[in-house]
Amino acid sequence: ELCDDDPPEIPHATFKAMAYKEGTMLNCECKRGFRRIKSGSLYMLCTGNSSHSSWDNQCQCTSSATRNTTKQVTPQPEEQKERKTTEMQSPMQPVDQASLPGHCREPPPWENEATERIYHFVVGQMVYYQCVQGYRALHRGPAESVCKMTHGKTRWTQPQLICTGEMETSQFPGEEKPQASPEGRPESETSC
């Protein structure tokens, strides 16, 4: 079941999936001046069996000006840096989710890929949040959102990360320093 909505945006934070559940789709988008090859896939799909998951289909981009040239999928590390949704700015890796059964790793970039990846997530997908540069988390607890099915509708749980900037901190003297650093993450709740 696809999630109806995108993961929630929260102020001064970005999110990232560490791995993608089977059924996740990634649009084959090309950067400006390039387009999908005529017979090319619309999306990549995370599929698998009990022991192994991988991305089906390949995304291929060709110059809008040239009709015949095709560009194969080749990793381009420098392009990886451009994409908002595929980069994390800190070593936050709560779980090596890519090693979980039924999950695919981040697909390698393809040549002339668009700067931002568009994923279509499925129920059960988890994304992790972190504060953008210049902001810090108010506490050291879990910071994620999970796509769940509730009352027949899909919804993302509310991330519990609050990011604050220096200016805001000085306005709020009521902050007390964390005394502990609990591990774990919000438990799943019974709904309905």
Epitope: E9, P11, H139, R140, Q171, E175
Partner: antibody, heavy 116, light 107 residues
Framework: EVQLVQSGAEVKKPGESLKISCKGS????????IAWVRQMPGKGLEWMGI????????RYSPSFQGQVTISADKSINTAYLQWSSLRASDTAMYYC?????????WGQGTLVTVSS | DIVMTQSPSTLSASVGDRVTITCRAS??????LAWYQQKPGRAPELLIY???TLESRVPSRFSGSGSGTEFTLTISSLQPEDFATYYC?????????VGQGTKVEIK
């Protein structure tokens, strides 16, 4: 089922102290922010402050800073709102709610009446 | 603090009417806005978050729109149980702030 259950109504005199409670159940209490919201008679909602029970990090709205204290005891899944010296203007309904950004679950409210 | 201003303060309407409530923020809050409904003697209930995302139990006659500084809550066809007070709340910047409320009453 997620539930927030608040302590009962209180009638107090000005200058007295008070601590009201909000007990969470049906979820991992330590991993979710709890906010306190005031509603004075016939008035709107005012966000007072918020606490993360896992490590007791607390933030207050500037309007309530120094007026109240928010705390939590994670061993009994309970958040508290307290006053050291009540005033008549503290008469209101007080709600706890699970956040941190928007509030999906609310307590039933605790009515605090301060009168001489 | 970001100031949230709702209009109108009171709205008289009949069952079946289309009702629109406006909420304005004193500065841009992107889509970090929630709407609540409160009935007398009851705790508020979340209707909408992220300006337009309907909470799972909320009937589809409710909808939210807007971004930046101007937002609207629309009830497409007012039902008897919808007579209540409605509040908008921003969560873009600490401290979260709430509009003064709009009371929807029977005409």
């Amino acid at each position: 089922e997620v539930q927030l259950v608040q302590s009962g109504a209180e009638v107090k005199k000005p200058g007295e102290s008070l601590k009201i409670s909000c007990k969470g159940s049906g979820y991992s209490f330590t991993n979710y922010w709890i906010a306190w919201v005031r509603q004075m008679p016939g008035k709107g909602l005012e966000w007072m402050g918020i606490i993360y029970p896992g490590d007791s990090v607390t933030r207050y709205s500037p309007s309530f800073q120094g007026q109240v204290t928010i705390s939590a005891d994670k061993s009994i899944n309970t958040a508290y709102l307290q006053w050291s010296s009540l005033r008549a203007s503290d008469t209101a309904m007080y709600y706890c709610a699970r956040g941190p950004y928007y509030f999906e679950y609310w307590g039933q409210g605790t009515l605090v009446t301060v009168s001489s | 603090d970001i100031v949230m201003t709702q209009s109108p303060s009171t709205l008289s309407a009949s069952v079946g009417d289309r009702v629109t409530i406006t909420c304005r923020a004193s500065q841009s809050i992107s889509s970090f806005l929630a709407w609540y409904q409160q009935k007398p003697g009851r705790a508020p209930e979340l209707l909408i978050y992220k300006a337009s995302t309907l909470e799972s139990r909320v009937p589809s006659r409710f909808s939210g729109s807007g971004s930046g500084t101007e937002f609207t809550l629309t009830i497409s066809s007012l039902q008897p149980e919808d007579f209540a007070t409605y509040y908008c709340q921003q969560y873009k910047s600490f401290s979260w702030t709430v509009g003064q409320g709009t009371k929807v009453e029977i005409k």
